[in-house]
């Protein structure tokens, strides 16, 4: 009888002991941002990307919050950033200002707090998109491990920000927490 | 649709200057290069240069490179093109342009006459 | 710089016949697998107007009597057959490279 008992504890507990590691899953940060196409500055120069999409498509966001074109955390703790930039031209959509191109993106962490900027990530490379050549096409992937505290924003900086590829599955960056800081 | 539309006819003195003006409609101003051509009867068709009216970046053929300058102004969607030091043989029709979604100047301003002649 | 040499200067055909017009370049033309040659039709005090764009695309609106051929360094223009309407002067022109160029023009007459 008591034995009965006992693995019946066993199974109550364990059953409590998944929903407590669910619901501290469901609680676990986490964000992907697509880019919003109706929103993207011209030009060649290197801008903050401030529109995203944050709950439709691709896009979700829990316990983080977006606002201002930034994702800032709500939970410390050791967090994976991404984010892929895609840059792309066709030629019916106009010509190019120069054949020789700087496509860049850059993940940058502001500190509230303490202001203060810093590059968390940088990628990208020189091109040379001949006007010559009907379509051209330029990817880029960043990720990274960094501990973050609560308050702090995450925000994207790209160069040439008009030849963007507007896509969903193309532009976007995101974040999950990992784990708590000790 | 695209249009260019370009300034009147001059007559002017040799050694003066001239700016001609070509107001584009119909397109995004900023993202694609406007060429200038000018027709001369002795010469037929010669492409001068191009502005690409957002940064301001411009390209000339060697020729008149000394003494053209081409200007934009993207409040108001208008490419500008100044000759200096003229002579007789600058008297000539010349054209704004820009090129087709493809390949190719599908979109031609109407042209203006300039007359060099004391 | 690309010169352009068109043959003939000038050309006399028939009303119904064909009209073949030649562009030859001083060097290629060609890159990234396209012809960067053009024909263009100009009729007096008008600006040219496209006619074949890379060398054998009939650009929108013009009469499929107009076709294009060619690449790298010789290219040919055809009319067929040539209506009284196509009495103009035809121009070809390069933008593989600055500084763009033009041939030196044909001046089409209908018999």
């Known amino acids: 009888g008591s034995q009965h008992i006992r693995a019946e504890k066993a199974m109550v507990d364990g059953s409590w002991l998944d929903l407590a590691k669910r619901s501290k899953l469901e609680a676990q940060p986490f964000a992907h941002l697509t880019i919003n196409a109706t929103d993207i500055p011209s030009g060649s120069h290197k801008v903050s990307l401030s529109s995203w999409y944050h709950d439709r498509g691709w896009a979700k966001i829990s316990n983080m919050t977006f606002s201002n074109g930034k994702l800032i955390v709500n939970q410390d703790g050791f967090y994976y950033l991404y984010a892929n930039i895609c840059f792309r031209h066709h030629e019916t959509s106009g010509d190019l200002a120069t054949e020789y191109l700087q496509l860049m993106v850059y993940v940058t962490k502001t500190s509230i707090k303490i202001p203060s900027s810093h590059t968390l990530m940088k990628g990208g490379s020189t091109k040379y998109w001949s006007g010559n050549s009907e379509f051209h096409f330029y990817s880029i992937n960043v990720g990274g491990f960094f501990k973050l505290r609560s308050g702090e924003e995450i925000s994207i900086e790209v160069s040439n920000p008009s030849l963007l590829d507007p896509d969903q599955d193309a532009t976007y960056f995101g974040a999950f927490k990992v784990r708590d800081i000790d | 649709q695209v249009q260019l539309v370009q300034s009147g006819a001059e007559l002017v003195q040799p050694g003066a200057s001239v700016k001609l003006s070509c107001k584009a409609s119909?397109?995004?101003?900023?993202?694609?290069?406007l060429q200038w051509v000018r027709q001369t009867p002795g010469q037929g068709l010669e492409w001068m240069g191009a502005?690409?009216?957002?940064?301001?970046?411009?390209k000339y053929t060697q020729k008149f490179k000394d003494r053209v300058t081409i200007t934009a102004d993207t409040s108001t969607s208008t490419a500008y093109m100044q000759l200096n030091s003229l002579r007789s043989e600058d008297s000539a029709v010349y054209y704004c342009a820009r090129r087709g979604s493809r390949r190719g100047i599908a979109y031609w301003g109407q042209g203006t006459l300039v007359t060099v002649s004391a | 710089n690309i010169v352009l040499t068109q043959s003939p200067a000038s050309l006399a055909v028939s009303l119904g016949q064909r009209a073949t017009i030649s562009c030859r370049a001083s060097e290629s033309v060609d890159s990234y697998g396209r012809s960067f040659m053009h024909w263009y039709q100009q009729r007096p005090g008008q600006p040219p107007t496209l006619l074949i764009y890379?060398?054998?695309n009939l650009e929108s609106g013009v009469p499929v009597r107009f076709s294009g051929s060619g690449s790298r360094t010789d290219f040919t223009l055809t009319i067929d057959p040539v209506e009284a309407d196509d009495a103009a002067t035809y121009y070809c022109?390069?933008?593989?490279?600055?500084?763009?160029?033009f041939g030196g023009g044909t001046k089409l007459e209908i018999k």
């Open positions: 022109q390069q933008d593989n490279e600055d500084p763009y160029t």
């Open positions: 502005i690409y009216p957002g940064p301001g970046n411009t």
């Open positions: 119909g397109y995004t101003f900023t993202t694609y290069w």
């Open positions: 890379l060398a054998s």
